[in-house]
Interface confidence: low
């Protein structure tokens, strides 16, 4: 067969769908690999072909589009399952071709089982809500394209195992779930089950997401450097180990990049010829405020090193701060005989 541009197995798009539910899967060629869309390809006389490799098999085989009730069908650049079965799991390939052109990509599809509490191996998207921030909503995700707006599905929301009704601060409103005032107790997994009729059958779409209540932007402050500070002096003798922690508190800020770094005499540690190591640890509060600690360490400090300026810097979307550590050379304690001798004017 003639050469085909093979984009390989696109594991970035590991698709997971629930067993016994409809699934619509777009050919990734048009989404991520080619610069034209399906309509353009179709108008140009290109044909989209689908095939698959079953789980734990090597053999590529055509997809059976002649199953009862059109269980699997292709519509434009979408592969439809109405509904999926567990043994639909495998690697699916869509190939766009004519006599002179060929391009294909494969992607893994995993059909996943869920229990009666919606627990499953499905990777869950995380939706962050601000703590005590007023009304916030989450929307039942990835149900676009299954039915037009003229269809009125039934939507039921669950928190964990429990149907959401008469909850204090959580109100189902169709495709949306409203949180009147989000609290830490609202953390958890939320599931919407969308039920709609199609061609004499009733289908269900189950979508679960994790809600995480995080710090509110109302309470957000610039980074706070707890250490170094003015109360601690790092006094060392040459040859000792110098350890200076830089501990910074960052308020939670959506999509903010929190950074901590040291400068030594105004330079990054990498740009200076001393044997310095920096170890970082990060911890989070329940509302995802972040504490970063960077410990600057010089194994055997020299008197030159003890004269340098050590400054901890921190930056977030709220601003940038810096604090110098107080470092000095320990003055050796005077020896008793010398002091006495000097005192009596002995020579």
């Amino acid at each position: 067969s003639e050469r085909c541009d093979d984009w390989g197995l696109d594991t970035m798009r590991q698709i997971q769908v629930f067993e016994d539910e409809p699934a619509r899967i777009k050919c990734p060629l048009f989404e991520h690999f080619l610069k034209f869309n399906y309509s353009t390809a179709h108008s140009a006389g290109l044909t989209l072909i689908w095939y698959w490799t079953r789980q734990d098999r090597d053999l590529e085989e055509p997809i059976n589009f002649r199953l009862p009730e059109n269980r699997i069908s292709k519509e434009k650049d979408v592969l439809w399952f109405r509904p999926t079965l567990l043994n639909d799991t495998g690697n699916y390939t869509c190939m766009l071709r004519n006599t002179t052109y060929c391009s294909k990509v494969a992607f893994p599809l995993e059909v996943v089982q869920k229990d009666s509490c919606f627990n499953s191996p499905m990777k869950l998207p995380v939706h962050k809500l601000y703590i005590e921030y007023g009304i916030q909503r989450i929307t039942c995700p990835n149900v676009d394209g299954y039915f037009p707006s003229s269809v009125k599905p039934t939507i039921t929301w669950y928190m964990g195992c429990y149907k959401i009704q008469n909850f204090n601060n959580v109100i189902p409103e169709g495709m949306n779930l409203s949180f009147l005032i989000a609290l830490i107790s609202n953390n958890g997994n939320y599931t919407c089950v969308v039920t709609y009729p199609e061609n004499g059958r009733t289908f269900h779409l189950t979508r679960t997401l994790t809600v995480k209540v995080v710090g509110s932007p109302k309470n957000a402050v610039p980074p706070v450097i707890h250490s170094p500070n003015d109360h601690v002096v790092y006094e060392k003798e040459p040859g000792e180990e110098l350890l200076i922690p830089c501990t910074v508190y960052f308020s939670f800020l959506m999509d903010s990049r929190n950074e901590v770094w040291w400068t030594i005499d105004g330079k990054k540690p990498d740009d200076i010829t001393i044997d310095v190591t920096i170890n970082e640890s990060i911890s989070h509060s329940r509302t995802e405020d972040e504490t970063r600690t960077q410990i600057l360490s010089i194994k055997k400090v020299t008197s030159e090193d003890l004269k340098r300026s050590y400054v901890c810097h921190a930056r977030s979307a709220k601003g940038e701060v810096a604090k110098a550590a107080k470092v000095k050379q320990k003055v050796p304690a005077p020896r008793y005989t010398v002091e006495l001798a000097c005192g009596f004017g002995a020579t």
């Epitope: 979408v78 394209g145 003229s150 269809v151 009729p197 199609e198």
Partner: antibody, heavy 119, light 111 residues
Framework: EVQLQQSGPELVKPGASVKISCKAS????????MNWVKQSHGKSLEWIGH????????TYTEKFKDKATLTVDKSSSTAYMELRSLTSDDSAVYYC????????????WGTGTTVTVSS | DIVLTQSPASLAVSLGQRATISCRAS??????????MHWYQQKPGQAPKLLIY???NLDSGVPARFSGSGSETDFTLNIHPVEEEDAATYFC?????????FGSGTYLEIK
């Protein structure tokens, strides 16, 4: 064979109400939306609204919100439309229509019920 | 609401010739690649009957001389060759959005 059999013609006085029926046969009644459409004499078709026979939930166009009420009786596979506060503008043929999924078109139409409002 | 403008309001076509009816929507009826535009035929004293669904799909039992085409906002119903029994009013309808709306109708007369 899929059929929608509607009740007979109605002659009603202005201000009165009328309830017309649509009996479905040949398919599972609760699996398809039931729509209602109005056709005034010599005019085009106007969508009134639909009902999900399974849940009983309804959607109406703005124009018919205070005019029509859609209900179903699942046990007899019958859909009903009640029209209230009738005026001469309500004189028309009313159709019940089954709506099919995926492309949401109207594949089976009822026989039609003629409502005449006259004093 | 989506407004459907049908043209012409009426046309007369000789037996065996082609009849072309247009329907323009005030906004796109493209639903993820499927165009939710449908065509119905209505004869006097009868209920409308589905001819074409989703722009170009012939309903079962409808003769192959009927065909539909178009995309986004512009759609066409073609009848070729026209037969005596095709004398009727033809309506287009969209189902992408509530409320469903219909065109004003085109009356086809056979000469």
């Amino acid at each position: 064979e899929v059929q929608l059999q509607q009740s007979g013609p109605e002659l009603v006085k202005p201000g009165a109400s009328v309830k017309i029926s649509c009996k479905a046969s040949g398919y599972t009644f609760t699996d398809y939306y039931m729509n209602w459409v109005k056709q005034s004499h010599g005019k085009s078709l106007e969508w009134i609204g639909h009902i999900n026979p399974n849940s009983g939930s309804t959607t109406y166009t703005e124009k018919f919100k205070d005019k029509a009420t859609l209900t179903v009786d699942k046990s007899s596979s019958t859909a009903y439309m009640e029209l209230r506060s009738l005026t001469s503008d309500d004189s028309a043929v009313y159709y019940c229509v089954r709506r099919i999924g995926k492309n949401w078109h109207c594949d089976v139409w009822g026989t039609g019920t003629t409502v005449t409002v006259s004093s | 609401d989506i407004v459907l403008t049908q043209s012409p309001a009426s046309l007369a076509v000789s037996l065996g010739q082609r009849a072309t009816i247009s329907c323009r929507a005030s906004e796109s009826v493209n639903f993820h690649g499927t165009h939710l535009m449908h065509w119905y035929q209505q004869k006097p004293g009868q209920a409308p009957k589905l001819l074409i669904y989703a722009a170009s799909n012939l309903d079962s039992g409808v003769p192959a001389r009927f065909s539909g085409s178009g995309s986004e906002t512009d759609f066409t119903l073609n009848i070729h060759p026209v037969e005596e029994e095709d004398a009727a009013t033809y309506f287009c309808q969209q189902s992408i959005e509530d409320p469903f709306t219909f065109g004003s109708g085109t009356y086809l007369e056979i000469k």
